[in-house]
């Protein structure tokens, strides 16, 4: 079952997700998607990073923490009831079936 996070309409929502880079600046690709994590990657991607930077994002979704240190927690700005649901954070650690995936449930009141 998913860990539940709450936010109020009009506020910012925070969905935590972290990993420890093998070395400072040695980043791994991360994707955030609306909906549970599929078998690979993310569905309905709202934001993604590559080995260097945030390389895809949609409006209202951003990383507030220091993603270069592995803080890839998602902030959703000015939430509405439509933002309720499951979100997937997938950390794509290189190798054979090494992904770490987290399904987080956002409840908007």
């Amino acid at each position: 079952s998913e860990v539940e996070y709450r936010a109020e309409v009009g506020q910012n929502a925070y969905l935590p997700c972290f990993y420890t880079p093998a070395a400072p600046g040695n980043l791994v690709p991360v994707c955030w998607g609306k909906g549970a994590c599929p078998v690979f990657e993310c569905g309905n991607v709202v934001l993604r990073t590559d080995e260097r930077d945030v390389n895809y994002w949609t409006s209202r979704y951003w990383l507030n923490g220091d993603f270069r240190k592995g803080d890839v927690s998602l902030t959703i700005e000015n939430v509405t009831l439509a933002d309720s649901g499951i979100y997937c954070c997938r950390i794509q650690i290189p190798g054979i079936m090494n992904d770490e995936k987290f399904n987080l449930k956002l409840v908007i009141k």
């Epitope: 690709p29 998607g33 909906g35 549970a36 599929p38 078998v39 690979f40 990657e41 993310c42 569905g43 309905n44 991607v45 993604r48 895809y56 794509q92 650690i93 290189p94 190798g95 054979i96 079936m97 090494n98 992904d99």
Partner: antibody, heavy 121, light 107 residues
Framework: EVMLMESGGGLVKLGGSLKLSCAAS????????MSWVRQTPEKRLEWVAT????????YYLDSVKDRFTISRDNAKNTLYLQMSSLNSEDTAVYYC??????????????WGQGTSVTVSS | SIVMTQTPKFMSTSVGDRVSVTCKAS??????VAWYQQKPGQSPKPLIY???TRHTGVPARFTGSGSGTDFTLTISNVQSEDLAEYFC?????????FGAGTKLELK
């Protein structure tokens, strides 16, 4: 036009090895995940392996993970499947397929024509 | 592994009919279901992803529905070119798995 062309199939002895290739054209190969899927003589489809666009992340079916190796050469627009310790269960038509992922993961939106692998005792 | 139980195995139809194929997942798969069409001697062709979204170029007579564990592919106004085998697949969790197929034949 998107094209995927498999090659390298054939008749191989039990315990033998084979390397399949899939030449891609008509799209930016390095921007897609790629997969191998096989179809048994009974027409059942079975996912075999998937590789990320950069080649950094790899996923296998449990029954092949110690025997098969998926790889790609983005400079040559080519996907590979190295198969070893082949057994009768590996007899199938092997398809390569393209997996879009960037804004939404979608499995196998284009398939090649397939290459046949027959394992004989 | 998630088992996709597809029914029926065979279906006889006439041009103009409406037919439905169902797939039942052994575990919850959200809407991570795709449908493929395979004509004899050809490779599979994608029809539907995310349970209900048609791929580009797929005629509107093909409709996917369902979520959770129960999914349906409906072909309304069947055409002769629709005579083929249809497969569902789940892509919710590893390994990605397919149904055993439904062969659509002419009566």
């Amino acid at each position: 036009e998107v094209m995927l062309m498999e090659s390298g199939g054939g008749l191989v002895k039990l315990g033998g090895s084979l390397k399949l290739s899939c030449a891609a054209s008509g799209f930016t190969f390095s921007s897609y995940y790629m997969s191998w899927v096989r179809q048994t003589p009974e027409k059942r489809l079975e996912w075999v392996a998937t590789i990320s666009n950069s080649g950094g992340s790899i996923y296998y079916l449990d029954s092949v993970k110690d025997r098969f190796t998926i790889s790609r050469d983005n400079a040559k627009n080519t996907l590979y499947l190295q198969m070893s310790s082949l057994n009768s269960e590996d007899t199938a038509v092997y398809y390569c397929a393209r997996d879009p992922y960037y804004s939404n993961y979608v499995p196998m939106d284009y398939w090649g024509q397939g290459t046949s692998v027959t394992v004989s005792s | 592994s998630i088992v996709m139980t597809q029914t029926p195995k065979f279906m006889s139809t006439s041009v103009g009919d409406r037919v439905s194929v169902t797939c039942k997942a052994s575990q919850y798969v959200d809407t991570y279901v795709a449908w493929y069409q395979q004509k004899p001697g050809q490779s599979p062709k994608p029809l539907i992803y995310s349970a209900s979204t048609r791929h580009t170029g797929v005629p509107a007579r093909f409709t996917g529905s369902g979520s959770g564990t129960d999914f349906t592919l409906t072909i309304s106004n069947v055409q002769s070119e629709d005579l083929a085998e249809y497969f569902c697949a789940q892509y919710s969790s590893s390994p990605l798995t397919f149904g055993a197929g439904t062969k659509l034949e002419l009566k």
